[in-house]
Interface confidence: medium
């Protein structure tokens, strides 16, 4: 039994990390390996982490981390019985993927505005509360042409825009995902999508 | 209740030897870190060890390295410090104190009473 | 080891006063400092960890500034329960230390 992709690992910056990698054959992940995690920090101890499968050859484990800062560092073992296939390290600050935003809301009674609010996926005492941006991509359920992102670059987690920058009559979709500049994170997962119909006044053409 | 019980503080001379306790209860002791502070008469507090939840690893200050040994018994949610070649220098009111978090996370957020262990000749 | 110095030795402040409490390390802890609390015959009691989370059930009053090397406990306005001894401790390495401690009397 050999690794064949190592592992690679992305952290949510709270709580969780998940780290994936592929065997040489098909795997049991579950029964079949291990995957210890300790953090480098004064009388850390070892966790282990029962993987899970992803696709034939694929495993993923998720890593439960009681809280994060910029220094942790973390060892990696992947283990096969009394085996030890891999030993690598990982540190999460270096490596973060933001959980995704959540309840995305449409408000449609502000006069041909529209309102977008979610909400930030992190309590207020963790780092990268402070430090999220985001980008909205809206969409025409009618007209796969008709889709554009809004990048929010300001922290608070809302996005208005006139009604009429969108046609009228029609229904459309949103979502939001985030990340953060500081830690150069990847982007995070979409938020599920809301939909609205977009209706708004036209103004008498003149002639 | 959540608190931390130490015992087996008391007057002995240079040279002996005494074993202190800290009964905890209210939490899931076996998860926690824990470590043993003390604060002579007067005087500001001294970190003395550290154990790490299994009770596999440990550390200590220099002061009382070779001297003092931690242990833990996690069935009876109980911490030690066995203490031996006393010397008038460790006459202090000795604390047990639970760490804030698994992680460990080497802040202390809940403290016994302190129990007093006084070395005279 | 990492010796923290804690300033001033006493501060006497009536309540009302906002208190203004200081702990330097002789190298980088980065933010893993934290400030207890400690009345005469009792234990000490955690308020600020890793220099500015406030602990479980203590008031918005305190708060805690600061990384690297310089760190600062604020009191915003004194309760007459708030005078005692203030220590700071590092976590950053061992072995784990603490300031040689504040004392905040009643003026």
């Known amino acids: 039994m050999k690794v064949l992709q190592e592992p690679t690992c992305v952290s949510d910056y709270m709580s969780i990390s998940t780290c994936e990698w592929k065997m040489n054959g098909p795997t049991n992940c579950s029964t079949e390996l291990r995957l210890l995690y300790q953090l480098v920090f004064l009388l850390s101890e070892a966790h282990t982490c029962i993987p899970e499968n992803n696709g034939g050859a694929g495993c993923v484990c998720h890593l439960l981390m009681d809280d994060v800062v910029s220094a942790d560092n973390y060892t990696l073992d992947l283990w096969a019985g009394q085996q030890l296939l891999w030993k690598g390290s990982f540190k999460p600050s270096e490596h973060v993927k933001p959980r995704a935003p959540g309840n995305l809301t449409v408000h449609t009674n502000v006069s041909d505005t529209l309102l977008l609010t979610w909400s930030n996926p992190y309590p207020p005492d963790n780092y990268l509360y402070n430090h999220l941006t985001y980008a909205v991509n809206i969409w025409s359920e009618n007209d796969p042409a008709d889709f554009r992102i809004y990048n929010v670059t300001y922290l608070e987690p809302s996005l208005r825009i006139a009604a009429s920058t969108l046609k009228s009559g029609i229904s459309y979709r949103a979502r939001v995902r985030a990340w953060a500049q500081c830690y150069n994170t990847t982007w995070s997962e979409w938020s599920p999508s809301t939909k609205w119909h977009n209706s708004y006044r036209e103004p008498f053409e003149q002639h | 209740e959540v608190q931390l019980l130490e015992s087996g503080g008391g007057l002995l001379q240079p040279g002996g030897s005494l074993r202190l306790s800290c009964a905890a209860s209210?939490?899931?002791?076996?998860?926690?870190?824990m470590s043993w502070v003390r604060q002579a008469p007067g005087r500001g507090l001294e970190w003395v060890s550290a154990?790490?939840?299994?009770?596999?690893?440990?550390s200590y200050a220099d002061s009382v390295k070779g001297r003092f040994t931690s242990s833990r018994d996690n069935s009876k949610n109980t911490l030690y410090l066995q203490m031996n070649s006393l010397r008038a220098e460790d006459t202090a009111v000795y604390y047990c104190?639970?760490?804030?978090?698994?992680?460990?996370?080497?802040?202390?957020?809940?403290w016994g009473r302190g129990t007093l262990v006084t070395v005279s000749s | 080891e990492i010796v923290l110095t804690q300033s001033p030795a006493t501060l006497s402040l009536s309540p009302g006063e906002r208190a203004t409490l200081s702990c330097r390390a002789s190298?980088?802890?980065?933010?893993?400092l934290a400030w207890y609390q400690q009345k005469p015959g009792q234990a000490p009691r955690l308020l600020i960890y890793?220099?500015?989370n406030r602990a479980t059930g203590i008031p918005a009053r305190f708060s805690g500034s600061g990384s690297g090397t310089d760190f600062t406990l604020t009191i915003s306005s004194l309760e007459p329960e708030d005078f005692g001894v203030y220590y700071c401790?590092?976590?950053?390495?061992?072995?784990?230390?603490f300031g040689g401690g504040t004392k905040v009397e009643i003026k």
């Open positions: 209210g939490i899931t002791f076996s998860t926690y870190a």
């Open positions: 154990i790490s939840g299994s009770g596999d690893s440990t």
């Open positions: 104190a639970k760490v804030i978090a698994a992680r460990p996370h080497w802040n202390f957020d809940l």
């Open positions: 401790q590092q976590r950053s390495d061992w072995p784990l230390t």
């Open positions: 890793d220099a500015s």
């Open positions: 190298q980088s802890v980065s933010r893993y």
